[in-house]
Interface confidence: low
Amino acid sequence: LNTTILTPNGNEDATTDFFLTSMPTDSLSVSTLPLPEVQCFVFNVEYMNCTWNSSSEPQPTNLTLHYWYKNSDNDKVQKCSHYLFSEEITSGCQLQKKEIHLYQTFVVQLQDPREPRRQATQMLKLQNLVIPWAPENLTLRKLSESQLELNWNNRFLNHCLEHLVQYRTDWDHSWTEQSVDYRHKFSLPSVDGQKRYTFRVRSRFNPLCGSAQHWSEWSHPIHWGSNSSKENPFLFALEA
Amino acid sequence: AVNGTSRFTCFYNSRANISCVWSQDGALQDTSCQVHAWPDRRRWNQTCELLPVSQASWACNLILGTPDSQKLTAVDIVTLRVMCREGVRWRMMAIQDFKPFENLRLMAPISLQVVHVETHRCNISWKISQASHYFERHLEFEARTLSPGHTWEEAPLMTLKQKQEWICLETLTPDTQYEFQVRVKPLQGEFTTWSPWSQPLAFRTKPAALGKDT
């Protein structure tokens, strides 16, 4: 189990998300050229893409990927069964839900099949690499003459996600943003009925079930209020 | 048996203070009474002197430590007793097994300030005081604005269902004096209640520029 260790007052010890180990570099032969770094993301805990920059190779090379889970029941080395390609060269691997074990150390190994000594291993904490789908079904409820409540849904365990709400009016230069915990609702307690408001939300797998840094895509925006009748330079910049 | 109706209510501020109110019909005003706190799993105990706040009610604050120290958790149970002196002896008037994180009332928000004011809007910020780190972001707020010619009781409540320590008040009248208050509540606790209202913050909107509608 890979964990973030916290002392009782909430101070975190630093933990790294991956480790790179390459073969020793005595001379710069092909076998000692560094392999590209593998980047993995777990999409909504439905599938995982592990990708690398295939164009960083000196010549087009179909690198192979193996993976396993360290110190667990799933520690048997597995071959990638579903490669992703970039211009007919392997550039990634897709793993399906049944192959994803969020709370075990995921070990990924990239290898040059023509130079078997040329390999690099990384250890990843998958719970820190989850990217949820964008929030859906944004709805606005009028609580009173001047108050709005924004609600949304996520296709995931709600308590695992935190959210970022952004809103702006047709008179604003920039978005106003506010973080929201797992409750997936946001109150705007004072609105101006003469302005048109736009809201959008994104979500992140943090902090209760993981420590992911990456946010989901933004939701589709939702609007409220009337278009301002006054001439307004920002009116058409809402989606910028 | 204790004569008359007795009511003993206490709240924990989530850090190092338990505030109690005891009311007793027909109690003697000049009786000396105390609240004793005995936690079930801590080495300390604490006492405070009940002081009259009305004809038949007394209040006191149990100071458990420095203001920001975390003295209790959700597994603690504190036995609270009201003890009154009767001659040379102490008599127990009320008792309760107090679960601190089921009976929360935070301190009123502090440091209210105007961040930015215009003719029709005003941005105000505040800070929470002595709130446990256990809450993380699991807090909500209510706010109200006092307009000229109205009372606080008439002011509509504004709800913030998220931990947001600022507000942008819209549709204000230019060149007008307002007051603003905010209060806070944790999500946790069956008997948890709102904090007292903050000290009011007075502010004035900017006057409208002549010949312009801002």
Partner: nanobody, 119 residues
């Protein structure tokens, strides 16, 4: 109703190991943070360790860090505490407690299991 039953305690020599278990029932186990807390003879309650509902975030008291490992099996509604390099000062009644996202030390706890570390 909520029930937490600890087991696995006993007498062990200094430097030895024990594994405590906690069987939970009466609530949706994988919705809750869980903790281990302990009480040494004649002393106050000491919080030992805490694990989030999914097992992704773990807290340890400084006194046990590096020696104790908390884990959970949500499928079997079970919480575990693996204890290595036990010392005399680890002698205590160990309780399993149900927590939540707000208060890590919980709202319900079991009857406890006694761990005695002595030569």
């Amino acid at each position: 109703q909520v029930q937490l039953v600890e087991s696995g305690g006993g007498l062990v020599k200094p430097g030895g190991s024990l594994r405590l278990s906690c069987a939970a029932s009466g609530f949706t186990f994988n919705d809750y943070y869980m903790s281990w807390i302990r009480q040494a003879p004649g002393k106050g309650l000491e919080w030992v360790s805490h694990i989030s509902s999914s097992g992704s975030t773990i807290y340890y008291a400084d006194s046990v860090k590096g020696r104790f490992t908390v884990s959970r099996d949500n499928a079997n509604n079970s919480l575990y505490l693996q204890m290595h390099s036990l010392r005399a000062e680890d002698t205590a009644v160990y309780y399993c407690a149900r927590g939540d996202a707000v208060s890590i030390t919980g709202d319900y706890r079991g009857q406890g299991t006694l761990v005695t570390v002595s030569s």
